[in-house]
């Protein structure tokens, strides 16, 4: 059914309705706004943007806006003792040091409080010794080093170039490898697109830029001092030895000016293959250690920064449902930024502050949606999920009993191209449909949809004449919602050409370089795409809202799970004499998911045929229809990751930002021929494959027939 | 059940060649890292030789290096190790072992004995 | 090379005794270490793996300890068939080099 059904509204206050009140031109100026000085977690300048935005969405008509503020664990630099690495020689003496700042863009010389590049939660310490390259610093990369190129980093420096993965993984995997130290850098191969300019003359990474970012593995934990509750005045707090996830050895990010001076002496092995190498005039040996006249040279890191307990604020808004007011549906994305945020996170605020000036508009005329839409401006996303996490463990009840969806709203824009969604597969048919009433803002797609554009420039590998659609991973602040508490999850932004763009992310993330003028010169100058954007985020929202039959559909989660169950089961095939030494049977899992497939069937069907009008039967079908995601969830967790509970799809192990699907059985199998002890390691794939297929059953066992 | 089978030991004069192979079953061989270790009489033991699942990357001991040659047959679930240039203090009972750092399975041995 | 020196080089016990067997080695190696128990005319075969996991079938009177350069391999209460010789193993690096073994013999 369309949304003009949802609560005796007029015609006019439809979707269309909606749409058409979002304007470019205001998230145009939403976004300068939100980006002339830095808004870093934490900060006085932070805490009054969270003020004036509860000021304007109080404005815009939401019922109420509120603060809602934690205090966390959060990493600053000294100010006083900077961090930097340097080259010694063997009397001990500097004779090159990294670059203590970036060279501010032009316009903002004079900005204050522009925090230097730096590794959010390295430990404080002044490592020296031996530097060993190490790729992307995946695992794959140690499996090279460590088990084909017999190179043990064990109490070496090592030295990593961003992109790929989640630089978390890459800390982890190092201090797993028993190195003393990281060095992150951004290479031009992945950070410097061939044809474009650097800034301020194009989007492209300077030599003097650098990646900020926090070297957490939390797992889904939030504050690292307070796992599965929230940090308020009376919280119980951990001992920093004890806090989650906090790296053990120090870590620092350079750019590739810097990067030059230290790789261009490095000696050892070669290269194992062109893999490793980058695009800098330098040879990527491996090491251990500098060349021939350098090899008395060593590298020794100075970090200094400090672990604070600090207050954070997130800004909560609430536009109360009129027919189910208990139902929430969230739109929510953060507001802290490493400086400037010009992409990230306020391209993304900005077109959330729209869209509640859209919403307030409807409200001020009368309207309201079926269900509750709460607004969230999180806080300190950048320092592992923070504020959403926080609020959500503050929250779990009301959210595991009325949480119908949540919708992420962080970067609008990592480039110019096409769209990019993750999402549950229950949310699959909604953004079909959305983005078929949309039009594409794409050069050549004039008058053409969304889904068109779409589906021509990223085709689904699956299914012809549909749009590619990923998988949820993490690294945002749809987390705890999606892998946690089991809410239906949807994420949509613009993106870059990843087949003629190999670089990782855009070029100038979490750099100063990453302003208002990037956007407006270089991305967006129209801010098409940022309203595209909003209509998708905006009209998933609306549609979650106000439809009276939650635009859920259960078919495409079995269609889903089919095909993960193939994945998994081909992934175990590559073992088969292990397979009948074991006993290892898929059947079960693939019984549950034959199980499922019927039971979303006729679900499906009766969900066409019930009565509409009878109050009950539609709560109770929709409630089939939320609770299904929840069904997923198991309450002990994933081994060793207690916060990532999904059993379908969790954060992988090897690479947070993206999804895995099973994971339980993916990691239970990941590497096992290395594994030292077959039957324990076999016996743990049977465990995995016996708790997906009752999950799987479990299930589908909710959208059965109640009686 | 995991097995390996070593066989191709015997006696040789010094300087002289000696090829032996190990067949498994039991496991998906293709996919493991196998090793040779060695243990002269009376004494402890040595590892010698490693190979990667592909066979693309192998390592020795250098008191092997440069002599001794391991490979694998993933077809024939076969793995090997060509010895040449053999001397007296080669004269070991040679394991092939399943696995690389830690050797979870072992063969029962074969014996290599350099003498004139 | 890393180099793993064992001690006792043997020891004479008798059934019932808690037993305990000593490995050090010449530099760090971490959690890389593992104990193997080998029969006169068989192969070894691998008890203790990273310092302290009992290997599948082995007996949970065997335990592993340690960290750093010194690791121990204790037989809580020592049974006929654990008349054996013991090696120690480190795994950080290779060469992987072993101990030069432990008899353990009836008293």
């Known amino acids: 059914k369309s949304s003009n059904e949802a609560t005796n509204i007029t015609p006019k206050h439809n979707m269309k309705a909606f749409l058409d009140e979002l304007k470019a031109e205001n998230i145009k100026k939403f976004l300068y706004n939100f980006t002339q000085i830095p808004h870093l977690a934490g900060t006085e300048q932070n805490f009054q943007l969270a003020k004036q935005i509860q000021s304007q969405w109080k404005e815009f008509g939401l019922d109420s806006v509120e603060l809602a503020h934690y205090d966390v664990l959060l990493s600053y630099p000294n100010k006083t003792h900077p961090n930097y690495i340097s080259i010694i020689n063997e009397d001990g003496n500097e004779i090159f040091n990294t670059s203590l700042f970036e060279p501010p863009p032009p316009g903002y010389e004079n900005v204050s409080d522009i925090v230097p590049p730096f590794s959010a939660f390295s430990p404080q310490g002044m490592p020296e010794g031996d530097l060993v390259y190490v790729n992307y610093a995946r695992t794959e990369d140690f499996f090279k080093l460590e088990r084909d190129m017999k190179i043990n980093c064990s109490g070496k420096i090592v030295i990593a170039r961003y992109g790929k993965v989640f630089r978390g993984n890459k800390v982890k995997n190092a201090q797993l490898a028993g190195a003393k130290g990281v060095i992150l850098y951004s290479d031009p191969a992945d950070y410097f697109a061939p044809g474009v300019k650097s800034y301020p003359d194009g989007w492209n990474l300077p030599g003097g830029g650098v990646q900020r970012g926090n070297i957490l593995n939390l797992n889904g934990a939030g504050d690292p001092l307070t796992p599965g509750y929230p940090a308020n005045e009376y919280a119980y707090r951990r001992g920093i030895a004890e806090a989650v996830g906090l790296p053990s050895i120090p870590v620092h990010p350079i750019g590739y000016y810097d990067a030059q001076k230290l790789l261009e002496k490095m000696g050892g092995s070669a290269p194992p293959d062109s893999s490793w190498r980058g695009s800098l005039k330098v040879p990527y040996n491996v090491g251990p250690g500098f060349t021939g006249n350098f090899s008395t040279q060593k590298v020794k890191m100075h970090i200094h920064s400090t672990n604070e307990v600090t207050r954070i604020y997130n800004v909560i808004g609430t536009l109360r449902g009129a027919v189910e007011p208990d139902r929430y549906v969230i739109l929510g994305g953060h507001r802290d930024s490493w400086v400037f945020g010009g992409i990230d996170p306020q391209s993304g605020a900005a077109v959330v502050h729209e869209i509640v000036r859209s919403f307030g508009t409807l409200k001020k005329e009368g309207w309201r949606p079926r269900r509750t839409i709460l607004f969230a401006s999180w806080d300190a996303e950048e320092f592992g999920l923070l504020g959403s996490t926080e609020w959500a463990e503050e929250n779990s009840r009301l959210l595991q009993e009325r949480g119908v969806a949540y919708i992420n709203a962080d970067s609008s824009i990592e480039g110019n191209y096409t769209l990019r969604v993750d999402c549950t597969p229950l949310m699959y048919s909604l953004v079909h449909n959305l983005t078929k009433e949309l039009k594409s803002p794409d050069e050549g797609f004039e008058g053409k949809s969304l889904y068109e554009s779409w589906t021509k420039k990223s085709p689904s590998p699956e299914f012809s004449g549909m749009p590619r659609i990923s998988k949820l991973g993490s690294g945002n602040d749809f987390e705890v919602f999606f892998q946690r508490l089991g809410i239906a999850s949807g994420r949509a932004r613009y993106t870059k050409n990843w087949e003629t763009n190999k670089f990782s992310g855009y070029p100038l993330y979490h750099s100063v370089y990453e302003t208002y003028e990037l956007v407006e010169k270089f991305y967006d100058p129209m801010f098409k795409y940022h309203l595209t954007v909003a209509q998708v985020r905006g009209g998933m929202v609306f549609e979650l809202a106000n439809s009276i039959v939650l635009p859920f559909d259960c078919r495409d989660y079995a269609v889903v799970l089919r095909k993960y169950a193939d994945k998994i089961y081909s992934i175990s095939m590559k073992h088969p004499q292990e397979m009948k030494t074991y006993s290892v049977s898929f059947d079960s899992l693939f019984s549950a998911v034959k199980n499922f497939t019927e039971i979303a069937s006729k679900f499906s069907e009766r969900l066409q045929d019930f009565d509409k009008s009878n109050p009950i039967v539609l709560r109770m079908m929709n409630d089939q229809l939320m609770f299904l995601e929840r069904a997923f969830i198991d309450p002990l967790g994933l081994p060793d990751r207690p916060f990532y509970r999904h059993v379908i799809y969790a954060p992988s192990s090897h690479n947070k930002y993206a999804g895995e699907s099973f994971p339980g059985i993916y990691d239970a199998l990941f590497d096992i021929e290395s594994k030292v002890d077959p039957s324990k390691a076999w016996g743990e794939v049977k465990r995995q494959i016996y708790v997906a297929a009752f999950t799987v059953q479990a299930a589908a066992e909710t959208l059965s027939e109640v009686a | 059940e995991v097995q390996l089978l070593e066989s191709g030991g015997g006696l040789v004069q010094p300087g002289g060649s000696l090829r032996l192979s190990c067949a498994a079953s039991g496991f998906t061989f293709g996919n493991y890292r196998m090793t040779w270790v060695r243990q002269a009489p009376g004494k402890g033991l040595e590892w010698v030789s490693e190979i990667s699942p592909s066979g693309g990357y192998t390592y020795y001991a250098d008191s092997v290096k440069g002599r001794f040659t391991i490979s694998r047959d993933n077809s024939k679930n076969t793995l090997y190790l060509q010895m040449n240039s053999l001397r007296a203090e080669d004269t070991a009972v040679y394991y092939c072992?399943?696995?690389?750092?830690?050797?979870?399975?072992w063969g029962q041995g074969t014996l290599v004995t350099v003498s004139s | 090379d890393i180099q793993m020196t064992q001690s006792p080089s043997s020891l004479s016990a008798s059934v019932g005794d808690r037993v305990t067997i000593t490995c050090r080695a010449s530099q760090d190696v971490s959690s890389g270490v593992a104990w193997y128990q080998q029969k006169p005319g068989k192969a070894p075969k691998l008890l203790i793996y990273?310092?302290?996991n009992r290997f599948s079938g082995v007996p949970s009177r065997f335990s592993g300890s340690g960290s750093g350069t010194d690791f121990t391999l204790t037989i809580s209460s020592l049974q006929p068939e654990d008349f054996a010789t013991y090696y120690c193993?480190?795994?950080?690096?290779?060469?992987?080099?072993f101990g030069q073994g432990t008899k353990v013999e009836i008293k």
């Open positions: 193993q480190q795994n950080l690096a290779p060469p992987y080099t």
């Open positions: 990273k310092v302290s």
């Open positions: 072992a399943k696995g690389f750092r830690i050797f979870d399975y």
